[in-house]
């Protein structure tokens, strides 16, 4: 499956929206930095099959959607930007779903990519626990926004790599 160019553009648009969502000076949040343990190995295109990487991307976008769809998230961010962000994520989910099913049969996906999906879920679980521990403070959300931007950037670079390998 050749990930469409529109997917890469969508990812870039999502990153731009995330960048625009900042509300407070990030400089006041330095002490709130946290090691979320981004599962970089899951997205390593050299180690994993293409279908696994795509599946992990899909899970990451799904989890990002879930994270930013919460009541606490709605209170933290600008509603208009958040709605635009949802649309971009939804479009990417559709692109990736088509891609995953094309790569391997639907039945095999769940078994084959269980570990990578679990790693991504645990990563987002750590993010959620961090937010809860910080009582969803503005700085906690800033740190999470920066972390999601970094993981999106990382996966965007990998998707470029996957397209080149085709």
């Amino acid at each position: 499956c050749d990930l469409p160019q529109t997917h890469s553009l969508g990812n870039r648009r999502a990153l731009i929206l995330l960048a625009q969502m900042g509300r407070i000076s990030h400089f006041s949040c330095l002490k709130d930095r946290y090691d979320f343990g981004f599962p970089q190995e899951v997205f390593d295109g050299n180690q994993f099959q293409k279908a696994q990487a795509i599946s992990a991307f899909h899970e990451m976008i799904q989890q990002t959607f879930n994270l930013f769809s919460t009541k606490d998230s709605s209170a933290a961010w600008d509603e208009t930007l958040l709605d635009k962000f949802y649309i971009e994520l939804f479009q990417q989910l559709n692109d990736l779903e088509a891609c995953v099913t094309q790569e391997v049969g639907v039945e095999e996906i769940a078994l084959m990519n269980e570990d990578s999906i679990l790693a991504v879920r645990k990563y987002f679980q750590r993010i959620t626990l961090y937010l809860m521990g910080k009582k969803y403070s503005p700085c906690a959300w800033e740190v999470v926004r920066a972390e999601i931007m970094r993981s999106f950037s990382f996966s965007t670079n990998l998707q470029k790599g996957l397209r080149r390998k085709d």
Epitope: A19, L30, K31, R33, D35, A146, E147, R150
Partner: antibody, heavy 121, light 107 residues
Framework: EVQLVQSGAEVKKPGESLKISCKGS????????IGWVRQMPGKGLEWMGI????????AYSPSFQGQVTISADKSISTAYLQWSSLKASDTAMYYC??????????????WGQGTLVTVSS | DIQMTQSPSSLSASVGDRVTITCRAS??????LNWYQQKPGKAPKLLIY???SLQSGVPSRFSGSGSGTDFTLTISSLQPEDFATYYC?????????FGQGTKVEIK
């Protein structure tokens, strides 16, 4: 390859203005902050301030607040440090360095080669 | 502001020696502590970040430890290229502050 390339050495007179630059390459310029560090002759490192090139938000050390201005032009991946009126005490080596912002990653992992500023009448 | 105090300010050692430099913060900085090496006429180089993480490409003879207010940089077996000035820096909060430096000289 990540690189921060600074502008060349400057010799200025007291009261003159100056703007030095730091150009980033080999990475996403707006994904990292750029900090500025001063080192006076034979002395230690002093943090001056920092900029987030994505939105040009800045933070300064109280010692340098009002003395210098930090800016950035993300379209050309360049950060700047400027003085409106130099003093002899501004004579120093100035370094730029990249900072991961709010991400859990190494601070100041890449540095520019430094710009020597000499202020003398 | 958080004050960073390094000791000693200078030391003389021989190749192969084990060298220890300490850094004390005026308040708890958890593990937000970095160590840099600077050679004359060169830009500083990051050695250790978050108190104990070795920066990529840095030899394993360098190690960092500590948390809260007291931190240590250890060079297990000093090499000729290690003669330089070492700085600690807190990254917990602005303004970011450096220690005054420790110069490691040849005995």
């Amino acid at each position: 390859e990540v690189q921060l390339v600074q502008s060349g050495a400057e010799v200025k007179k007291p009261g003159e203005s100056l703007k030095i630059s730091c150009k980033g390459s080999g990475y996403s310029f707006t994904s990292y902050w750029i900090g500025w560090v001063r080192q006076m002759p034979g002395k230690g490192l002093e943090w001056m301030g920092i900029i987030d090139p994505s939105d040009s938000d800045t933070a300064y050390s109280p010692s340098f607040q009002g003395q210098v201005t930090i800016s950035a032009d993300k379209s050309i991946s360049t950060a700047y440090l400027q003085w409106s009126s130099l003093k002899a005490s501004d004579t120093a080596m100035y370094y730029c360095a990249r900072h991961p912002g709010l991400n859990w990653a190494p601070d100041f992992d890449y540095w520019g080669q430094g710009t020597l500023v000499t202020v003398s009448s | 502001d958080i004050q960073m105090t390094q000791s000693p300010s200078s030391l003389s050692a021989s190749v192969g020696d084990r060298v220890t430099i300490t850094c004390r913060a005026s308040q708890s900085i958890t593990n937000f502590l970095n160590w840099y090496q600077q050679k004359p006429g060169k830009a500083p180089k990051l050695l250790i970040y978050f108190a104990s993480s070795l920066q990529s490409g840095v030899p394993s003879r360098f190690s960092g430890s500590g948390s809260g207010t007291d931190f240590t940089l250890t060079i297990s077996s000093l090499q000729p290229e290690d003669f330089a000035t070492y700085y600690c820096q807190q990254s917990l909060d602005f303004p970011l502050t450096f220690g005054q430096g420790t110069k490691v000289e040849i005995k």
